[in-house]
Interface confidence: low
């Protein structure tokens, strides 16, 4: 069982003789007369397990002491720290030829953790250890211990573990502490990236490249890397992480933005106060919620104030010219705090008797410069029907108008177009043909452009080719043409008249009268 002793964060202890409770029980060769396990008390009355040998009077000493098996835990290079006392031969009388002031340190790699014997030829020498001038004085009750500290390293190691051995060749030594450790670069956070515990490389100049992982609530900007140096120090930080949206760096962590603040992107910026007309009610906001009645357009940055739709345009004026209307208006009083205001025109055709019965004007109407997205405050509308009631609405819109559930940003005007000559009649039919008469019928013009006062029918014998024609006028949409010659081809044209004048004649209808006294009934445009 090992007790806890505090060592630097970059050192991982594999063996610490000072932390072992009870006997160490290392193997000595020879079993008697060489190294001996001796307990001494330190200044806190705690037993210290030491190994001592002091055969300075006898020549040709070869005393070995071997530790238990030490796992290497994946380390490729380990460090051995030895604290020891070594008697000065000059202080011992009569030992000049036999007394030594050094001992040798060895190691042996092995996968076997239960080797019972010391085989000297298996061990590889690490170094000869001598007492140097730098020692610490340790008070052990009634005595002062001159404690030397020496550190050696060995590697690269490849087997599961290893044994250490100490060879005495005739010195007076007490091994007070043996600590074996490897170095690691300890878990650290740099540039918001966490770098894990990393065992140092195999040789004393190697650098181990380590990829960092971003701390909670952060993401990579550039790949975070550091190099773990052989001494267990992190070197050359490269790359970094950035706090996620809704978080800012505080004390090396990414912490949520406070209420009333936000951060929209993963950047190194701090959280910002919510822009005008917006708020956040939770920590960690990536954007702020707009106040009631305020909105944020899709392409508005989170940093922009929330805005409103505009109010209605002002001072709408209309000017009717036959079947055209020019409209002009003024900008709204309130643009909603936005620059992207534009105007849409809505055209409705309304019944004269009931203005509430309005229908969209349809595609035949033309707008100059355009119907929607107008940037100017005027529009010209053409190709309207004459003598028709129209209502025009001018809508002011901006980037947030579509989010408004109750739009009230329009102004409207109702106008009536002037009367105009009607359009031509599309279809004329011969309903009944006899030897002496033809019954005609036709449709109202597509665009009457006013009140139809009468229809005019022009007809002539085909071979006369309009040199001699007759006119019949009627208010109805049908008429009987009498007094015709039998077996004769006639051509008929029909046109409508309003107060504004006649429209164009219809396409010609050719009909041939009968020779027999029976009636032929037809409805084509060219009955024969």
């Amino acid at each position: 069982v090992t007790g806890s002793r505090v060592y630097p964060a970059n050192e991982v202890t594999l063996l610490d003789s000072r932390s072992v409770q009870g006997e160490l029980g290392w193997i000595a060769s020879p079993l008697e007369g060489g190294w001996e396990e001796v307990s001494i008390m330190d200044e806190k009355n705690t037993p210290i397990r030491t190994y001592q040998v002091c055969n300075v009077m006898e020549p040709s000493q070869n005393n070995w002491l071997r530790t238990d098996w030490i796992t290497r835990e994946g380390a490729q290079r380990v460090y051995i720290e030895i604290k020891f006392t070594l008697r000065d031969c000059n202080s011992l009388p009569g030992v000049m030829g036999t007394c030594k002031e050094t001992f040798n340190l060895y190691y042996y790699e092995s996968d076997n953790d239960k080797e019972r014997f010391i085989r000297e030829n298996q061990f590889v020498k690490i170094d000869t250890i001598a007492a140097d001038e730098s020692f610490t004085q340790v008070d052990i009750g009634d005595r002062i211990m001159k404690l030397n500290t020496e550190i050696r390293d060995v590697g690269p190691l490849s087997k599961k573990g290893f044994y250490l051995a100490f060879q005495d060749v005739g010195a007076c030594i007490a091994l007070v502490s043996v600590r074996v450790f490897y170095k690691k670069c300890p878990l650290t956070v740099r540039n918001l990236a966490q770098f894990p515990d990393t065992i140092t490389g195999a040789d004393t100049s190697s650098l181990v490249e380590v990829r960092g992982s971003c701390v909670n609530n952060s993401e990579e900007k550039d790949v975070p890397k550091m190099y773990c140096g052989a001494d267990g120090e992190w070197l050359v930080p490269i790359g970094n992480c950035l706090c996620n949206a809704g978080h800012e760096e505080r004390s090396g962590e990414c912490q949520a933005c406070k209420i009333g603040y936000y951060k929209a992107l993963s950047t190194d910026a701090t959280c910002a106060k919510c822009p005008p007309h917006s708020y956040s009610v939770w920590e960690g906001a990536t954007s702020c919620t707009c106040d009631r009645g305020f909105f944020r357009a899709d392409n508005d940055a989170a940093s922009m104030p929330c805005t409103r739709p505009p109010s209605a345009p002002l001072n709408l004026i209309s000017n009717v010219n036959e079947t055209s209307v020019n409209l002009e208006w003024s900008s709204p009083q309130n643009t909603g705090g936005r620059q992207d205001i534009s105007y849409n025109v809505v055209c409705k055709k309304c019944g004269a008797g009931d203005p509430s019965k309005c229908r969209p004007c349809g595609s035949g109407v033309h707008y100059t410069p355009q119907q929607n997205g107008l940037k100017t405050t005027k529009v010209s509308i053409t190709d309207l029907l004459a003598h028709t009631n129209y209502t025009f609405e001018i809508w002011a819109v901006n980037g947030v108008s579509k989010y408004n559930p109750n739009p009230d940003q329009s102004v409207s005007v109702t106008v009536t177009t002037n009367q105009a000559a009607p359009s031509s009649i599309a279809l004329v039919q011969a309903k009944e043909v006899t030897r002496y008469s033809v019954a005609l019928a036709w449709l109202e013009p597509d665009r009457p452009n006013g009140v139809i006062l009468e229809y005019e029918v022009k007809y002539y014998e085909k071979d006369q080719n309009e040199r001699s024609y007759r006119i019949v006028r009627t208010a109805a949409r049908n008429t009987d043409i009498k007094g015709l010659n039998p077996l004769t081809s006639y051509v008929f044209h029909v046109r409508a008249r309003t107060a504004a004048g006649y429209g164009d004649f219809s396409e010609p209808l050719e009909v041939t009268t009968n020779t027999v006294p029976s009636r032929i009934i037809g409805d084509g445009a060219n009955s024969t």
Epitope: E73, G74, S158, Q194, P196, S213
Partner: antibody, heavy 124, light 107 residues
Framework: QVQLVQSGSELKKPGASVKVSCKAS????????MHWVRQAPGQGLKWMGW????????TYADDFKGRFVFSLDTSVSTAYLQISSLKAEDTAVYYC?????????????????WGQGTTVTVSS | EIVMTQSPATLSVSPGERATLSCRAS??????LAWYQQKPGQSPRLLIY???NLADGIPARFSGSGSGTEYTLTISSLQSEDFAVYYC?????????FGQGTKVEIK
Amino acid sequence: QVQLVQSGSELKKPGASVKVSCKASGYTFTDYSMHWVRQAPGQGLKWMGWINTETGEPTYADDFKGRFVFSLDTSVSTAYLQISSLKAEDTAVYYCARIPLYYYGSRYWYFDVWGQGTTVTVSS
Amino acid sequence: EIVMTQSPATLSVSPGERATLSCRASENIYRNLAWYQQKPGQSPRLLIYAATNLADGIPARFSGSGSGTEYTLTISSLQSEDFAVYYCQHFWGTPWTFGQGTKVEIK
């Protein structure tokens, strides 16, 4: 869901070449390296090597250096294994499998998703 | 390279019985070991990673243990769908080698 879908079986003559594809979906292609594993008929699994999907750098196991080429088309999240100068002993099922490209706090690696395998038969 | 040795080559077990599969590495792999299951005509499926961690979606009757060079996969009560070939694989220094496999068959 996360998937690795490999191209269909191939029958080739000795000396020919073959190119096996492995299309990834359901995850960010460049966050995981792509590895190739061979399984000869009635045999066990053998790791062939891998390609870094971020840099395109391939690493080949010793037995697969020379005739084997790993490549990528990141625009379609696809890794490729090309074998040239085919021999009868190349007859096997070839699997692609993914591994996180970086540790991200975990010290342990494993193949968590495998392709369904592509059978390559080399016969005259 | 590290050699992975699985034993036994074939294990005959009755449904409901316990199955213990062994995997030995030629050197310490520090728990960097995964176990896979492979059924005929299918690709391998991850069961265990880091020697003892159960992969997502794997039933709790599978468990892994071991450290150093000796590792074990245990199936506490074999179900019919568990009869397959099982492979171990190390991730301690490339090349990452697989064991030769243990076939678990119905007794």
